[in-house]
Interface confidence: low
């Protein structure tokens, strides 16, 4: 699942990386754009074992993975909030 | 203000079924991303997991405990419960219930506890 | 499942002194740049309290006399300085593998 929050809570993410996850291993993804109360953009990928990584937004892998899911939900589901499984 | 109590029989016998009860309040585990979970400790001795359950009902077991548990939830009334089937001496101790966190970069570490209710196993 | 050993099994500190805990898992306990290890202090007739987060990351109100440091298979858990009220057992935990596991404790006394 994809998603995109625009919330008024304060940044979420305390540390970020930017290791690969494997996309089998990736339950959902949240963004949350730049703005209330957080001076960038955070990236939150929800993984199936229930952990959850906070990724660094510049991450080539997380980039491209995002372009993918943006292109398979823009024909279907309306921005902001995109819910769809990940293959 | 997040909150949690256990309860329990204080005392049963061998071979019989331990029921337990968490009571919560100050977040419901209806929302994305809440787990409760049960923790047990033998008097003077360390600290063991048993089991918790997420907010999408995913159910999660201590392998050397799994035959005997089984951990439900009932959302609307802000309770978790355990059952231990078949229970011993050794299952004498206290039995914690406890709130997985909720932050984002990971949420399993036990961030709230509830005061414990102790169990004895007694013949 | 992962075993955590801590060590020493007690220590006593001179007040005002540095304490130091160690734990070391029997694999490593990072994922995806996170190392998935937590401490905890228990006092006499109380549960655990969170203390460290995320191997060294302080929870919010624990004074920073508390920190933790670490990464992978092994881990500090240092008290510096030592006052009276962290007299306690201290116990790490990971969560990177179910079944998520606890050390077995350290007792940390004043001198």
């Known amino acids: 699942v994809l998603e995109v929050y625009y919330t008024s809570l304060r940044c979420r993410c305390v540390q970020e990386s930017s290791v690969f996850i494997p996309r089998r291993f990736i339950d959902r993804i949240q963004i949350l754009p730049r703005g209330n109360g957080c001076p960038r953009k955070e990236i939150i990928v929800w993984k199936k074992n229930k952990s959850i990584v906070c990724v660094d937004p510049q991450a080539e892998w997380i980039q491209r993975m995002m372009e993918v899911l943006r292109k398979r939900s823009s024909s279907t589901l309306p921005v902001p909030v995109f819910k769809r499984k990940i293959p | 203000e997040v909150q949690l109590q256990e309860s329990g029989p204080g005392i049963l016998q061998p071979s019989q079924t331990l029921n337990l009860t968490c009571s919560f309040s100050?977040?419901?585990?209806?929302?994305?991303?809440?787990?409760v979970g049960w923790i047990r400790q033998p008097s003077g001795k360390g600290l063991e997991w048993l089991a918790h359950?997420?907010?999408?009902?995913?159910?999660r077991y201590n392998p050397a405990l799994k035959s005997r548990l089984t951990i439900s939830k009932e959302t609307s009334k802000n309770q978790v419960f355990l059952k231990i089937a078949n229970v011993d001496t050794a299952d004498t101790a206290t039995y914690y219930c406890?709130?997985?966190?909720?932050?984002?970069?990971?949420?399993?570490?036990?961030?709230?506890w509830g005061q414990g209710t102790t169990v004895t196993v007694s013949s | 499942d992962i075993v955590l050993t801590q060590s020493p099994a007690s220590l006593a500190v001179s007040l005002g002194q540095r304490a130091t805990i160690s734990c070391r898992a029997s694999?490593?306990?990072?994922?995806?740049?996170?190392?998935?290890m937590h401490w905890y202090q228990q006092k006499p007739g109380q549960p655990p309290k969170l203390l460290i987060f995320?191997?060294?990351d302080l929870e919010s109100g624990i004074p920073a006399r508390f920190s933790g440091s670490g990464s992978r298979t092994d881990f500090t858990l240092t008290v510096n300085p030592v006052e009276t009220d962290d007299v306690a057992t201290y116990f790490c935990?990971?969560?990177?593998?179910?079944?998520?596991?606890f050390g077995g404790g350290t007792k940390l006394e004043i001198k």
């Open positions: 406890t709130r997985i966190a909720g932050y984002y970069g990971s949420r399993d570490w036990f961030a709230y």
């Open positions: 100050g977040f419901s585990l209806s929302t994305f991303g809440m787990g």
């Open positions: 359950i997420w907010w999408d009902d995913d159910r």
């Open positions: 694999e490593s306990v990072d994922n995806s740049g996170i190392s998935f």
């Open positions: 995320r191997a060294s």
């Open positions: 935990q990971q969560s990177n593998k179910d079944p998520w596991t």
